[in-house]
């Protein structure tokens, strides 16, 4: 028994004086404990506990569940204890058949012997399978066989305790080990939509799903800055071992504007944590949002091809694509198509082929696009450049040579003698008279300008040129003309085309 | 065959009380710490109670400690939970099993499960 200096409180002593006794099945246990202080005897196995506030324990018969701890404590809080094993050839080991044990944790097989007289003390697997190579363990006889670092690959693994006696190898009941898998990486979180667009009343829902190794795993949805708590419904699936999915759904059954913001679906481990998020944008109705990919004045040479090309957003989706050219709509030449095949797509491409434009298709041209809340609209104008065309050229009774020529841009007209039979015309002559007409065609096609010369400046047989220019190309026209006498005679016109 | 046979469920109303019974067959439940578990409406499995093989120690989650009451009759192989002051939230499928894991995971589930009675508490 300890001993301890005179003055000081002393554990209570117990007879018999030995730390283990061994008592047969149906003999007599019996234990005094001697303290001026007694309190009580208590009683340990497995996870049973009895107490018994006698100093005296008695069990007059004994069985092999009497096998255990007994401890006695006095009044100061101190004890001393004496384990009993209870020999029972019918009952070798006491058992607790639960079995769960934490990855990389020891574990305890609760299979305590009855009788610590038996040999090889240790684990077997069942049916005679052999344990894994690297399982290792501790048998302690008063409390089972410590299982050290258990590996996830022991899940389920079918075991039991085991003794020899008397020769014989004696199996307990099984055991079937349950592996808690560590928290060996951050869950893997992801969500149905990255990013929502609806209209006032409209149900908002989006799905987190949540991957880890177990049910473990903590998740939650949260709105970015605000507390406030989320109705959220769960979903759960263990798709094997150590495969565990969760799918936390967030509804709003009727989105207001003033819930728009970013939705957060967080989740932790003992590893760490990792979110993923979702924007909700709530309308008070539906939108469409018309970008031009091309200036929406448009010059296009005569002869060539221009695509108009319109991006636009519509929420909710179109329902009505056109586009219009002098109130008549195409039926083909275009087409219509959402930029991104993405399901939250709202971002959408219309392009009108024009080809082989002509002169007198210039105009407005306009795309009309509607949805069920809105219509919208967007127009091009369109000049097509054309190089000047001679409308009339003529002598006027008043004297005068007259050139008319229309195109796009404007053309400007320039004259020019050339005196004899020289080829080259390269002498000026100033207008006398220049004026832009209004055109009677559309508002897009080409100006007419009229440019006139007083003939009487000319003394000498030749060729006068009117020469009309803009930025496409040139055409000329010429006044051919001879003298008799003091009268100019045969002026013939013609023109000469100059690309 | 494994059986464990779960009765003692129904209607309820708040602040009552019922008592479940779980008898075993094909299994000495003795050699087993016992476990009461339950499942609401759209929820997970969420541990309830615990006993220890000979039933001397108890355990007990925070949300029924004070209410409910889990004991055993090894004699009978038969397992109990008594549970009183009943809350709208006891709604579930309440189920025996074998085993009992400290750490209230039961990661990998029970080497035996019942099959569940329903308690439903409602005015």
């Known amino acids: 028994q300890p001993s301890v200096s005179p003055g000081e409180p002393s554990p209570p002593s117990i007879h018999p004086g030995k730390s283990d006794l061994i008592v047969r099945v149906g003999d007599e246990i019996r234990l005094l404990c001697t303290d001026p202080g007694f309190v009580k005897w208590t009683f340990e196995i497995l996870d049973e506990t009895n107490e018994n506030k006698q100093n005296e324990w008695i069990t007059e018969k004994a069985e092999a569940t009497n096998t255990g701890k007994y401890t006695c404590t006095n009044k100061h809080g101190l004890s001393n204890s004496i384990y009993v094993f209870v020999r029972d050839p019918a009952k070798l080991f006491l058992v607790d058949r639960s079995l769960y044990g934490k990855e990389d944790n020891d574990t305890l097989v609760r299979c305590p012997l009855t009788d610590p007289e038996v040999t090889n003390y240790s684990l077997k697997g069942c049916q005679g399978k052999p344990l894994p190579k690297d399982l290792r363990f501790i048998p302690d006889p008063k409390a089972g066989i410590m299982i050290k670092s258990v590996k996830r690959a022991y899940h389920r693994l079918c075991l039991h305790c085991s003794v020899d006696q008397e020769g014989k190898s004696v199996l307990s009941e099984k055991f079937i080990l349950k592996v808690r898998p560590a928290f060996k990486a951050v869950p893997v979180v992801s969500v149905s939509k990255a990013s929502y667009l609806l209209r006032e009343g409209e149900e908002f829902t989006v799905t987190c799903t949540i991957k880890d190794v177990s049910s473990s795993v903590y998740s939650t949805w949260k709105r970015e800055n605000s507390q406030t708590k989320l109705q959220e419904k769960y979903n759960s699936w263990h798709h094997g071992d150590f495969n565990y999915e969760r799918q936390a759904t967030l509804t709003i059954s009727s989105a207001r504007v003033n819930d728009s913001g970013v939705f957060m679906c967080y989740a932790n481990n003992t590893f760490g944590s990792a979110n993923v998020t979702t924007t909700l944008e709530v309308v008070d109705k539906g939108f469409i949002n018309i970008f031009p990919m091309i200036n929406t004045t448009v010059f296009v040479n005569d002869g060539e091809n221009v695509d108009l090309i319109v991006e636009y957003e519509a929420f909710p989706k179109p329902e009505h694509q056109q586009w219009i050219y002098m109130n008549r709509t195409f039926t083909d030449k275009w087409e219509d198509y959402p930029k991104s095949e993405n399901e939250s797509n709202i971002r959408y491409v219309s392009e009108l082929h024009l080809t082989r434009l002509k002169g007198t298709e210039g105009g407005t041209y306009t795309f009309l696009v509607s949805n069920s809340d809105v219509n919208a609209a967007i127009a091009f104008n369109v000049y097509v450049n054309t190089k000047p065309e001679i409308l009339t050229y003529d002598r006027l009774v008043n004297g005068m040579l007259q050139c008319v020529a229309a195109g796009f841009p404007e053309p400007t007209i320039d004259w020019y003698f050339c005196p004899g039979t020289e080829q080259r015309c390269s002498a000026s002559v100033l207008p006398v008279d220049v004026q832009t007409l209004n055109s009677s065609g559309p508002p897009f096609g080409k100006l007419v300008v009229q440019s006139s010369i007083d003939s009487s400046a000319f003394k000498h047989n030749g060729t006068v040129e009117c020469k009309a220019y803009n930025d496409v190309g040139k055409t000329s026209a010429y006044f051919n003309f001879a003298f008799k006498g003091n009268n100019k005679e045969q002026i013939h016109p013609h023109t000469l085309f100059t690309p | 065959e494994v059986q464990l046979l779960e009765s003692g469920g129904g209607l309820v109303q708040p602040g009552g009380s019922l008592r479940l019974s779980c008898a075993a067959s094909?299994?000495?439940?003795?050699?087993?710490?016992m476990s009461w578990v339950r499942q609401a409406p759209g929820k997970g499995l969420e541990w309830v109670s615990a006993?220890?093989?000979?039933?001397?120690?108890?355990y007990y989650a925070d949300s029924v400690k004070g209410r409910f009451t889990i004991s055993r009759d090894n004699s009978k192989n038969t397992l109990y939970l008594q549970m009183n002051s009943l809350r709208a939230e006891d709604t579930a499928v309440y189920y025996c099993?074998?085993?009992?894991?400290?750490?209230?995971?039961?990661?990998?589930?029970?080497?035996?499960r019942g099959q569940g009675t329903l308690v439903t508490v409602s005015s």
């Open positions: 099993a074998t085993g009992y894991d400290s750490s209230g995971h039961y990661y990998g589930g029970f080497d035996y």
């Open positions: 094909g299994l000495t439940i003795s050699t087993y710490a």
């Open positions: 006993i220890s093989t000979g039933g001397s120690s108890t």
